[in-house]
C-alpha cells in the first residue's frame, strides 16, 4: 500500500480468482483513543472499533472511503483505491490502446518545434468518475524539470456503438535549448483513477522523435505565362523553431485530382516554392518535415488549382 | 525518402554538401545495423545514449546560432579552446566563434573515425561476419574532415589484446551509430546555417 495523495491510498493486488488479497491496517488520524468506530462509504454498518482497523482487501467491494467516527463526529477519512496486477502486468482498463505507432500505445505525444513544449493525449470510453494527473521529467534517475498543466477533455467522438473521449495535456521543459542534443528521454507519467480503480501509464521519448511541424502557411499559386504550369509558394509555419536556416524543413508538394484514384504527382524540395502542372479540378497540397531528422510529416496545407 | 530533390549549387559553402552526404551515410548505416542486429538491443528506446565527445568537444555550444545565444538554457558550458584555421572559412565575415565551431566539428569527426575503425577491426574478426561498417560512411567522414582541413595531432587507433566480445561490440556499434547520427544532424544544421549567413 502506498499514498497517492493526502488520505488517498493505493492497494496493489495480484488479481486472480480466489486470491488472498492484501491485509491493510488503517489508523484514525486523531489524538482520541477510545470510542472510535469505522464505516465504509455511505453505509452505517460498523466495521470495527478502535484507533486502528485491520481489513483484508481482495476485491473492489473492499475498497472505498473508510471513515472513523466518535460520537457521531467524523474524525478522519482514508480512501482506498485498487491497482490490479494481472499475471505480472499492471491492468490497463481505463485507457484505450491507440495501436499507433505500435501496440500498447496508450499515450501519444507531439511537439510542433524544439522549444521543449509538447502535447500528449489519450483515449477512453469512460465518461464519468474519472480523474487524471500528469507528471513529467527529463530523465528518471536525476530528473530535470518539466511542467505540465491539467489534463482536459479535448474531443468527443462516436465510434460505432461507443462514445470515445480524448483527453490532452500540455507540458513545457523548464530549461530547454532548441539546439541541444538530447541524451536523456522525456518521461511522462499519467495517473488515472476511475471510481475505485487506479492505473498508471507512462511514455518515454525524445522531443526530436515526436516532432510534427504545423502545415506550411500562406500557400499561394502563381500561374506561369503561356503554360499549364504554376509556381506554388509557401512559408515556414509560425510555430516552427528559428532560425530557419538552422532548423530547416523539407517539403513535399502533391498534385491530386478530384478522384482519390487518380495518380498523385509528388515533388520533394528544400525550397519554399516549386513549379508544378495544375490539372483542372485538381488541388495542390504541401506538407513539411524536419530536413535533417525524419520525424513526422506535417498535415497537408491545400489550395484548389482553379 | 524517395527524393527527386534539387542538387546544391556548386558555388555554395564547401562543407554543406559533405555534411549532407555524412548524414545520409550514417542514417543508412544505422538502418542497416538495426535490421541486421534485430535480435540485439539496437533501437533508440533500448540503447543507452552515450556521447563519446562529451567533455572533449562542445560542438552544440560552439556552433550555436547567434539567435539562440540569448537563450540562457543554451549557454550552460561554452568552451572556447579550439584551433582556429580551416579551409571552410571561405568568407571574411567568419568570426572567431565560427572557427571554434568548425574545429569542434573536426574533433568530433576524428574521434568517431577512430572509434569506428577500431570497431570495424573487431567486427572483421567475428566468425559470424554479421555486420561491418559501411566503407562509404568512413570515406564520407574522411572527405568532410579534409574539407574542414584542420591540423591536429593524429589519434592512434586503439588496439586491444584481449579477445573481443562480439555481442558487446555490436551493442557498442549501435550506441555509437545513434550518437553519431544525432551529431551528424547538428553538423548539417550548422553547415546550413553558415551557408545561409
Amino acid at each position: 500500500i502506498w499514498e497517492l495523495k493526502k488520505d488517498v491510498y493505493v492497494v496493489e493486488l495480484d488479481w486472480y480468482p480466489d486470491a488472498p488479497g492484501e491485509m491493510v491496517v488503517l489508523t484514525c488520524d486523531t489524538p482520541e483513543e477510545d470510542g472510535i468506530t469505522w464505516t465504509l462509504d455511505q453505509s452505517s454498518e460498523v466495521l470495527g472499533s478502535g484507533k486502528t482497523l485491520t481489513i483484508q482487501v481482495k476485491e473492489f467491494g473492499d475498497a472505498g472511503q473508510y471513515t472513523c467516527h466518535k460520537g457521531g463526529e467524523v474524525l478522519s477519512h482514508s480512501l482506498l483505491l485498487l491497482h490490479k496486477k494481472e499475471d505480472g502486468i499492471w491492468s490497463t482498463d481505463i485507457l484505450k490502446d491507440q495501436k499507433e505507432p505500435k501496440n500498447k500505445t496508450f499515450l501519444r505525444c507531439e511537439a510542433k518545434n524544439y522549444s521543449g513544449r509538447f502535447t500528449c493525449w489519450w483515449l477512453t470510453t469512460i465518461s464519468t468518475d474519472l480523474t487524471f494527473s500528469v507528471k513529467s521529467s527529463r530523465g528518471s534517475s536525476d530528473p530535470q524539470g518539466v511542467t505540465c498543466g491539467a489534463a482536459t477533455l479535448s474531443a468527443e467522438r462516436v465510434r460505432g456503438d461507443n462514445k470515445e473521449y480524448e483527453y490532452s495535456v500540455e507540458c513545457q521543459e523548464d530549461s530547454a535549448c532548441p539546439a541541444a542534443e538530447e541524451s536523456l528521454p522525456i518521461e511522462v507519467m499519467v495517473d488515472a483513477v476511475h471510481k475505485l480503480k487506479y492505473e498508471n501509464y507512462t511514455s518515454s521519448f525524445f522531443i526530436r522523435d515526436i516532432i510534427k511541424p504545423d502545415p506550411p502557411k500562406n500557400l499561394q499559386l502563381k500561374p506561369l505565362k503561356n503554360s499549364r504550369q504554376v509556381e506554388v509558394s509557401w512559408e515556414y509555419p509560425d510555430t516552427w523553431s528559428t532560425p530557419h536556416s538552422y532548423f530547416s524543413l523539407t517539403f513535399c508538394v502533391q498534385v491530386q485530382g478530384k478522384s482519390k484514384r487518380e495518380k498523385k504527382d509528388r515533388v520533394f524540395t528544400d525550397k519554399t516554392s516549386a513549379t508544378v502542372i495544375c490539372r483542372k479540378n485538381a488541388s495542390i497540397s504541401v506538407r513539411a518535415q524536419d530536413r535533417y531528422y525524419s520525424s513526422s510529416w506535417s498535415e497537408w496545407a491545400s489550395v484548389p488549382c482553379s | 525518402r524517395n527524393l527527386p530533390v534539387a542538387t546544391p549549387d556548386p558555388g555554395m559553402f564547401p562543407c554543406l554538401h559533405h555534411s549532407q552526404n555524412l548524414l545520409r551515410a550514417v542514417s543508412n548505416m544505422l538502418q542497416k545495423a538495426r535490421q541486421t542486429l534485430e535480435f540485439y538491443p539496437c533501437t533508440s528506446e533500448e540503447i543507452d545514449h552515450e556521447d563519446i565527445t562529451k567533455d572533449k568537444t562542445s560542438t552544440v555550444e560552439a556552433c550555436l546560432p547567434l539567435e539562440l545565444t540569448k537563450n540562457e538554457s543554451c549557454l550552460n558550458s561554452r568552451e572556447t579552446s579550439f584551433i582556429t584555421n580551416g579551409s571552410c572559412l571561405a568568407s571574411r565575415k567568419t568570426s572567431f566563434m565560427m572557427a571554434l565551431c568548425l574545429s569542434s566539428i573536426y574533433e568530433d569527426l576524428k574521434m568517431y573515425q577512430v572509434e569506428f575503425k577500431t570497431m570495424n577491426a573487431k567486427l572483421l574478426m567475428d566468425p559470424k561476419r554479421q555486420i561491418f561498417l559501411d566503407q562509404n560512411m568512413l570515406a564520407v567522414i574522411d572527405e568532410l574532415m579534409q574539407a574542414l582541413n584542420f591540423n591536429s595531432e593524429t589519434v592512434p587507433q586503439k588496439s586491444s589484446l584481449e579477445e573481443p566480445d562480439f555481442y558487446k561490440t555490436k551493442i557498442k556499434l549501435c550506441i555509437l551509430l545513434h550518437a553519431f547520427r544525432i551529431r551528424a544532424v547538428t553538423i548539417d544544421r550548422v553547415m546550413s546555417y553558415l551557408n545561409a549567413s
Partner: antibody, heavy 115, light 112 residues
Framework: QVQLVQSGGGVVQPGRSLRLSCAAS????????MHWVRQAPGKGLEWVAF????????YYADSVKGRFTISRDNSKNTLYLQMKSLRAEDTAVYYC????????WGQGTMVTVSS | SYVLTQPPSVSGTPGQRVTISCSGG????????VKWYQQLPGTAPKLLIY???QRPSGVPDRFSGSKSGTSASLAITGVQAEDEADYYC????????????FGTGTKVTVLG
C-alpha cells in the same frame, strides 16, 4: 472453490458452426478476464482468444480471427466461444481458463471437424 | 507458430535432476514473467510455477523455476515416476499481450 465446467463440444462438418460454453462458479466472474486455449490431438497448447472482465476488449489468434467470437454473459457467469466456418485444423480439445498469475482451467471439451 | 522453444523430450532415472529450457526473445521472456505447466495424459494443464520461480501451494518443492535474460528453465530435482508428463512454458509478448505464448512442449520420460 473456483470451478469452470465446459460444454458444447462434438462432431461437426467443415464449414459448419458450434458454440462452446464455460460455466463459472466459486468466484466473482465479472471481475476477471478469461481465455480460450486449444490443443490439437498429439500437439501442444495454442492460445485462441481472450476477453476482458467487462467484455469491452476481445483479442484473437490470427488462425481464428474473423471466424471465432469470444463473448461472456456476466449475469449468467458464463463464457462462450462461437465457432463458424470450422475447418479440419480446428479439431482439438478446447479449454477455458481464468486470467491471472494463478489460473484455473476447465476440464476441456473435444471439437472434431470432419466430413 | 511457436516463439518459445523447448526441447521435444528429456529423460532421467528416478532421483535424478532433469531440466527443461525455454528460449524466447527480448519482447517476450525478456520483458515478462514465465509460467510452467504440467499436463498428464487426458487432463487439463496444471500450474507448476508462476512469476518465473514461484510455486503455488500444493506443488512439491522438487519443482523449481528460474529465468535469465531471454530464457527460462524448469528443474525437477529427484524426478519421480509420477512426473512423467508433458511440460509447457508460457509467457506474453509485450506487443500482443494478453495473448498467451506457449512453448513447444517437452515430454519428460522417467526411465527404469
Amino acid at each position: 472453490q473456483v470451478q469452470l465446467v465446459q460444454s458444447g463440444g462434438g462432431v461437426v462438418q467443415p464449414g459448419r458452426s458450434l458454440r462452446l460454453s464455460c460455466a463459472a462458479s466459486g468466484f466473482t466472474f465479472s471481475s476477471y478476464g478469461m481465455h480460450w486455449v486449444r490443443q490439437a490431438p498429439g500437439k501442444g497448447l495454442e492460445w485462441v482468444a481472450f476477453i476482458r472482465y467487462d467484455g469491452s476488449n476481445k483479442y484473437y489468434a490470427d488462425s481464428v480471427k474473423g471466424r471465432f467470437t469470444i463473448s461472456r454473459d456476466n449475469s449468467k457467469n458464463t463464457l462462450y466461444l462461437q465457432m463458424k466456418s470450422l475447418r479440419a485444423e480446428d479439431t482439438a480439445v478446447y479449454y477455458c481458463k481464468t486470467h491471472g498469475s494463478h489460473d484455473n482451467w476447465g476440464q476441456g471439451t473435444m471439437v472434431t471437424v470432419s466430413s | 507458430s511457436y516463439v518459445l522453444t523447448q526441447p521435444p523430450s528429456v529423460s532421467g532415472t528416478p532421483g535424478q535432476r532433469v531440466t527443461i529450457s525455454c528460449s524466447g526473445g527480448r519482447s517476450n521472456i525478456g520483458s515478462n514473467t514465465v509460467k510452467w505447466y504440467q499436463q498428464l495424459p487426458g487432463t487439463a494443464p496444471k500450474l507448476l510455477i508462476y512469476k518465473n520461480d514461484q510455486r503455488p501451494s500444493g506443488v512439491p518443492d522438487r519443482f523449481s523455476g528460474s529465468k535469465s535474460g531471454t530464457s527460462a528453465s524448469l528443474a525437477i530435482t529427484g524426478v519421480q515416476a509420477e512426473d512423467e508428463a508433458d511440460y509447457y512454458c508460457q509467457s506474453y509478448d509485450r506487443g500482443t499481450h494478453p495473448a498467451l505464448l506457449f512453448g513447444t512442449g517437452t515430454k519428460v520420460t522417467v526411465l527404469g
